[in-house]
Amino acid sequence: EKLPKAPVITTPLETVDALVEEVATFMCAVESYPQPEISWTRNKILIKLFDTRYSIRENGQLLTILSVEDSDDGIYCCIANNGVGGAVESCGALQVKMKPKITRPPINVKIIEGLKAVLPCTTMGNPKPSVSWIKGDNALRENSRIAVLESGSLRIHNVQKEDAGQYRCVAKNSLGTAYSKLVKLEVEVFARILRAPESHNVTFGSFVTLRCTAIGIPVPTISWIENGNAVSSGSIQESVKDRVIDSRLQLFITKPGLYTCIATNKHGEKFSTAKAAATVSIAEWSKSQKDSQGYCAQYRGEVCDAVLAKDALVFFNTSYRDPEDAQELLIHTAWNELKAVSPLCRPAAEALLCNHLFQECSPGVVPTPMPICREYCLAVKELFCAKEWQAMEGKAHRGLYRSGMHLLPVPECSKLPSMHRDPTACTRLPYLDYKKENITTFPSITSSRPSADIPNLPASTSSFAVSPAYSMT
């Protein structure tokens, strides 16, 4: 017969290190008689041995956690008691170890130059992983701008273009190493104008090239504005090299203007723009036209073919490099503008413009152009095209330039000779003489004041029908 013997733990518990999902076993070998009851605690709380996560062997002397979890970390104790003497206890720690795991990896970032970029890299692991970063193929060195935060995130102050590239974070502990996927840091740069267009003072009908160079990431787009509106004529040539865009606007100058180069690039939902402006002014060309040389020749163009008298000689101004082409281009431009005007105004305006640009010519030792008679000019301005003229002048006062007639090379009526002073010194417009016969088709005009359709006429006149100033016989 065996003598009773109080329990003695012959194999005290030791600290156990286990990875998540691994097996962890504590051994508590006990010698005693009779056989002891062995219970187990974790952090002083009794372990329920019917929990299927645990395995008990050899009468409780082996406790196994079949698949370790983070939460199993703690102090485990075995307590042996057989009723002989006191209960005995032995304790040991379970340290749940974990290979490094990147729980919040970095993501692709687009950042504007000069701002602060933060690439996240949150990790888990036991022992706590150290985090480092790789840029391209090389370990990233920290400096006054670049730092790896306690959290593992990479912070870059005052981002520079050279910070762009591919990054990955590396989490390392004694159990292993984890790498994030490669992410791209893209540095965006606000659009900036490197070379602004230059202002020009040129003669009427000259060609001018305005050049504008801009840089940015992404490469900016360049648009041109003429007096507040998109450029309607001219050709644009663009080239891009090394994130620099070079835009050249070639213009045929028929009027002065303010030309603005606008460089734009997009950053997410926002845009950045840079602007530079240049003026193109025209050297006083009405004066130079008087002084300038020219020649008389038959009109060979197309635009005014139906308006000008057949086989008439017209004046070509040699202050233009290529007078016939230059004047034809001017009228062509004007013709397109006239698409916007009323059916009443258009034919009258066409007659006025063709006869103004292609003036009747008296050949001689000095070829002399014959301007339009003032009365015909005023008729177009204040009767046929009154609405359009009024709109144009109103917009000009308010700094707005868009109307059907603002681009037209119209004469200044007040500066033209009067047919009453010298009927041979100016040109009549046959179209208006013909229209006079059908005066009933015009808007009704009272004998005292003009209607709202007609601008206020000079004080000496009251209506088209009675004014001697408008008499066309």
Partner: antibody, heavy 121, light 107 residues
């Protein structure tokens, strides 16, 4: 002297059943954890199942769970292995072994001579 | 399950040679490793338990070492009766696993 003697092996058709027995003597059977270990012809050892002395704790190899059942009768000092839905790959010598707590962990310190189970049509 | 990877799978040696067999566990298992010897047509026999403790009656030319994941069985001077197959086994998990065995043959 510890003695373990297996019986019940033989030829069985695939899908058939067989019950192996192990008669133990020379030690306190009821206090000992017992196990079955098998060895396919020309292959290595493979643990099959274990049962604690009081039958409260039973373990099976994952690959066999559901088809094999271990049991014991302490009054008869006998260990059993009920094998159902037998497959050709269950063909092996089946050993009965005693598990013993050692300085670290447990080991099979006593083995029977083995019984051959052949599963074939 | 814990895998036990044994190497080499076979080994030719001569009487008197020193022989080493290794076993690697798929996770840390402290010293919960046993070594068995099996001769053809016989049941296995426990040689070493707890990684390094010699089972009673086993000759002292057998020794074991290792902890954590890497374990070694060494026979310091091979005797004719030592030609057999050797197995490692882990008992850290209650789902016991054996190595695939190393067959030690006479050169």
């Amino acid at each position: 002297e510890v003695q373990l003697v297996e019986s019940g092996g033989g030829l069985v058709k695939p899908g058939g059943s067989l019950r192996l027995s192990c008669a133990a003597s020379g030690f306190t059977f009821s206090a000992s954890t017992m196990a079955w270990v098998r060895q396919a012809p020309g292959k290595g050892l493979e643990w099959v199942s274990s049962v604690s002395g009081d039958s409260h704790h039973i373990y099976y190899a994952d690959s066999l769970k559901g088809r094999f059942t271990i049991s014991r009768d302490n009054a008869k000092n006998s260990l059993y292995l009920q094998m159902n839905s037998l497959r050709a790959e269950d063909t092996a010598v089946y050993y009965c072994a005693r598990e013993r707590l050692l300085r670290l962990g447990v080991g099979f310190d006593s083995w029977g001579q083995g019984t051959l189970v052949t599963v074939s049509s | 399950d814990i895998q036990m990877t044994q190497s080499p799978s076979s080994l030719s040696a001569s009487v008197g040679d020193r022989v080493t067999i290794t076993c690697r566990a798929s996770q840390r298992i402290s010293g919960f490793v046993n070594w068995y010897q099996q001769k053809p047509g016989k049941a296995p026999k426990l040689l070493i338990y707890a990684a390094s403790t010699l089972q009673s009656g086993v000759p002292s030319r057998f020794s074991g070492s290792g902890s954590g994941t890497d374990f070694t069985l060494t026979i310091s001077s091979l005797q004719p009766e030592d030609f057999a197959t050797y197995y490692c086994q882990q008992s850290y998990s209650p789902l016991y696993t054996f190595g695939q065995g190393t067959k030690l043959e006479i050169k």
